[in-house]
Interface confidence: medium
């Protein structure tokens, strides 16, 4: 039950995270800029990965796409790539995890197959989340290191006045959405990986059967039998005998006096 809950919660958290990554990638407000100290008009400029927009106090808003690929900064291209890779991996991870969900029965799919699929989707979610966090962080770093600060081109005019005006860029809403979404996808992926451990069939230590050819009789102690899984009390593997290939539950439910060699 706990495994199913962990897997289901991991799926939901990852789903929300990937939806957030998609939203952040599509959002226009990656960096925002106020034309501060500029009496021309109250204008709010903001830029995304795909286009730039201007919103005026009058309510007029206009956006223009970046129609060039080659002319764009390499860092912007890198951020775009990271976000797209994150979305693609996340989408594939969601698709795989749907079939891996314990609550969904598809034919006669074994638990081991579901465990592998859960692990695969978990790893995909982790990588997806890391891609999104990396992309957003690279962009944020560009803002912090003044890469996106505009140094005005002011020509020496009749007055002989030359000035440099810097345009301040701040973090846009998309950065925070991206960070949170990336984190959620990462957490969801970790939860899926944890769920995978619970889904995998436990390896019982049936191979540790000790055969004695000598005449020494070994007495069977009722109640002392347990198939060693690493979780039982018999962790030192001291003389565990099993005459038949039964599950741990079967052995504990129906102890037999013939369980010795």
């Amino acid at each position: 039950m706990a495994v199913t809950a962990c897997q289901g919660l991991g799926f939901v958290v990852s789903l929300i995270g990937i939806a957030g990554i998609i939203a952040a990638t599509c959002m226009d407000q990656w960096s925002t800029q106020d034309l501060y100290n500029n009496p021309v008009t109250a204008v709010f400029n903001y830029q995304g990965l795909w286009r730039s927009c201007v919103r005026e106090s009058s309510g007029f808003t206009e956006c223009r796409g970046y129609f060039t690929l080659l002319g764009l900064p390499a860092m912007l291209q890198a951020v775009r790539a990271l976000m797209i890779v994150g979305i693609v991996l996340g989408a594939i991870g969601l698709l795989v995890s749907i079939f891996a969900l314990k609550c969904i029965r598809i034919g006669s799919m074994e638990d081991s197959a579901k465990a592998n699929m859960t692990l695969t989707s978990g790893i995909m979610f982790i990588v997806s989340g890391l891609c999104a966090i990396a992309g957003v962080s690279v962009f944020a770093n560009m803002l912090v290191t003044n890469f996106w600060m505009s140094t005005a081109n002011m020509y020496t005019g009749m007055g002989g006045m030359v000035q440099t005006v810097q345009t301040r860029y701040t973090f846009g809403a998309a950065l925070f959405v991206g960070w949170v979404a990336g984190g959620l996808t990462l957490i969801g992926g970790v939860m899926m990986c944890i769920a995978c451990r619970g889904l995998a069939p436990e390896e019982t230590n049936y191979k540790a059967v000790s055969y004695h050819a000598s005449g020494h009789s070994v007495a069977y102690k009722p109640g002392g039998f347990k198939a060693s899984t690493g979780f039982g009390s018999n962790t030192k593997n001291k003389k565990i005998y099993d005459g038949g290939a039964r599950t741990e539950d079967e052995v504990q439910s129906y102890p037999s006096k013939h369980d010795y060699v």
């Epitope: 005026e56 129609f67 002319g71 900064p73 996106w148 005005a152 081109n153 002011m154």
Partner: nanobody, 121 residues
Framework: QVQLVESGGGLVQPGGSLRLSCAAS????????MGWYRQAPGKQREFVAG???????NYAHSVKERFTISRDNAKNTMYLQMNSLKSEDTAGYYC???????????????WGQGTLVTVSS
């Protein structure tokens, strides 16, 4: 690179009118806000009037009711119609624009070389 070229300046009598033009040329992707500034000899450069891409306008108190700013987005040109000119309007008039540069993904604040307006009898 975006260049701004002002024209229309000259000598005019007090009470007269002038129309200044500012044309943007070069690698223009988008020019958002445009404005006029002036600088009288020995004084600081001051804001005169401004217009946004959407047509929102703003004026300095000293020129309100007398000056009118307009813009033709298709031609990337801005105009300043100056009426009822006074001697204190004598100055170099500079064109200013916020131009979006897609190559660097940033705004460039561009200034023109200026045009001289002299109001004298």
């Amino acid at each position: 690179q975006v260049q701004l070229v002002e024209s229309g300046g000259g000598l005019v009598q007090p009470g007269g009118s002038l129309r200044l033009s500012c044309a943007a040329s070069g690698n223009i992707f988008r020019i958002d806000t445009m404005g006029w500034y002036r600088q009288a000899p020995g004084k600081q450069r001051e804001f005169v009037a401004g217009i946004s891409r959407g047509g929102s306008t703003n004026y300095a108190h000293s020129v309100k009711e007398r000056f009118t700013i307009s813009r033709d987005n298709a031609k990337n040109t801005m105009y300043l119609q100056m009426n009822s000119l006074k001697s204190e309007d004598t100055a170099g008039y500079y064109c200013n624009a916020q131009a979006w540069d897609p190559g660097t993904i940033r705004y460039l604040e561009v200034w023109g070389q200026g045009t001289l307006v002299t109001v004298s009898s």
